[in-house]
């Protein structure tokens, strides 16, 4: 199971780097009444170092249709891809292919997904088949993780301490968490 759906996804990329599309109207519910007082996961600052501006991690947006088998989303979704090596912000290029990458001489820092979000998509299927509704997992933000000589790639360390979360603090949309499994499929993007 896992991410097999991702492998089959359409790669029809639309050159639009805008905001996330608005989710479809809510179903009948009293969502706000049911929210925890401090219900959201708190914002995670990707670089919790002494100098927050010291390191940077590029987030690229691209828009595409997603597929599930023969079915394709009625509307494209805007995804975030975490790109490149983490390094001092002043040395990171503004776009792919420009400037020099900064490579730390010590531990290896990599730019990987931090938060994920769910977005509802309606999938239209060929041959008059009934449409499908799915919730797709999309990257919402990126962060630097440290890979030391004591850890292999599957044991990436958070770059900076992440406090325990005894109570989720309210968090602005979109903020969901996602899967390690995605790492393998998107490895070339990072």
């Amino acid at each position: 199971q896992g991410w097999q759906a991702f492998k089959n996804d359409a790669t029809e990329i639309i050159p639009e780097l805008g905001e996330y599309p608005e989710p479809p109207p809510e179903l009948e519910n009293n969502k706000t009444m049911n929210r925890a007082e401090n219900g959201g996961r708190p914002p995670h600052h990707p670089f919790e170092t002494k100098d927050v501006s010291e390191y940077s991690c590029r987030e690229l947006h691209f828009t595409r249709y997603v597929t599930d088998g023969q079915c394709r989303s009625a509307k494209p979704v805007t995804e975030l891809v975490c790109s490149g090596q983490c390094g001092p912000a002043r040395l990171l290029p503004n776009a792919i292919g420009r400037g020099k990458w900064w490579r730390p001489s010590g531990p290896d820092f990599r730019c990987i997904p931090d938060r994920y979000r769910a977005q509802r998509v309606q999938l239209l299927c060929p041959g008059g088949a009934a449409p499908r509704a799915r919730k797709v997992r999309l990257v919402a933000s990126c962060k630097c993780k440290r890979l030391t000589r004591f850890h292999n790639q599957s044991e990436l360390k958070d770059f900076g301490p992440e406090a325990a979360r005894p109570q989720k603090g309210r968090k602005p949309r979109p903020r969901a968490r996602g899967a390690k499994a995605n790492q393998a499929e998107l490895e070339n993007a990072y």
């Epitope: 519910n29 969502k31 929210r35 959201g40 769910a118 977005q119 309606q122 509704a133 602005p172 499994a181």
Partner: antibody
Framework: EVQLVQSGAEVKKPGASVKVSCKVS????????IHWVRQAPGKGLEWMGG????????IYAQKFQGRVTMTEDTSTDTAYMELSSLRSEDTAVYYC??????????????WGQGTLVTVSS | QAVVTQEPSLTVSPGGTVTLTCGSS?????????PYWFQQKPGQAPRTLIS???DKHSWTPARFSGSLLGGKAALTLSGAQPEDEAEYYC?????????FGGGTKLTVL
């Protein structure tokens, strides 16, 4: 593979609180959407609340609003469900459940073994 | 809060076909309720059979299928086996807030 291991059975007095834990392995807690479901003896399943990745917030079922608190400790990959002001009708098996961490969100794919909470004077 | 209704009990003969349904007090069940179906046997935790109306899982036997039928979510069991005797629950998603049905006790005899 996601695995969930819950804390052991509890016996509580009416008016007390109980805190059930759910330890995640295979993935980190922050990668998953944890929900809590309970089942009274001989009764059906009842959703109590959980993390909604669309809004990034925890939603509680109306019935439990103000009495339940769902928290998580990412340093130990453990989720907690605390229910206060216990009454006899809260006697039930409490389950944590999570998604499969795939490209499509599929909730309630993996379940803990359940924790029996008995409320009795 | 919405109420989700299921048949309290159903009986099917071995090898026979049976359809369990799941309705919503708020109106017709649609794909946007992302219907789930669970199987639970005595003393065990529930097990997901179907997600998102019709999506089976790697462990779901091929004889189970999910669909929408007449404004309700439906779970069809074709070629019932003795081991299918269990309690079946549906679950509907009301915008991130979930409601379980009361369950259907399925007897295979």
């Amino acid at each position: 593979e996601v695995q969930l291991v819950q804390s052991g059975a509890e016996v509580k007095k009416p008016g007390a609180s109980v805190k059930v834990s759910c330890k995640v392995s295979g993935y980190t807690l922050s990668e998953l959407s944890i929900h809590w479901v309970r089942q009274a003896p001989g009764k059906g399943l009842e959703w109590m609340g959980g993390f909604d990745p669309e809004d990034g917030e925890t939603i509680y079922a109306q019935k439990f609003q103000g009495r339940v608190t769902m928290t998580e400790d990412t340093s130990t990959d453990t989720a907690y469900m605390e229910l206060s002001s216990l009454r006899s009708e809260d006697t039930a098996v409490y389950y944590c459940a999570t998604d499969s961490a795939g490209y499509w969100y599929k909730f309630f794919q993996h379940w803990g073994q359940g924790t029996l909470v008995t409320v009795s004077s | 809060q919405a109420v989700v209704t299921q048949e309290p009990s159903l009986t099917v003969s071995p090898g026979g076909t049976v359809t369990l349904t799941c309705g919503s007090s708020t109106g017709a069940v649609t794909i946007d309720h992302y219907p789930y179906w669970f199987q639970q046997k005595p003393g065990q935790a529930p097990r997901t059979l179907i997600s998102d109306t019709d999506d089976k899982h790697s462990w779901t036997p091929a004889r189970f299928s999910g669909s929408l039928l007449g404004g309700k979510a439906a779970l069809t069991l074709s070629g019932a086996q003795p081991e299918d005797e269990a309690e079946y629950y549906c679950l509907l998603d009301y915008g991130g807030s979930f409601v379980f049905g009361g369950g259907t006790k399925l007897t295979v005899l």
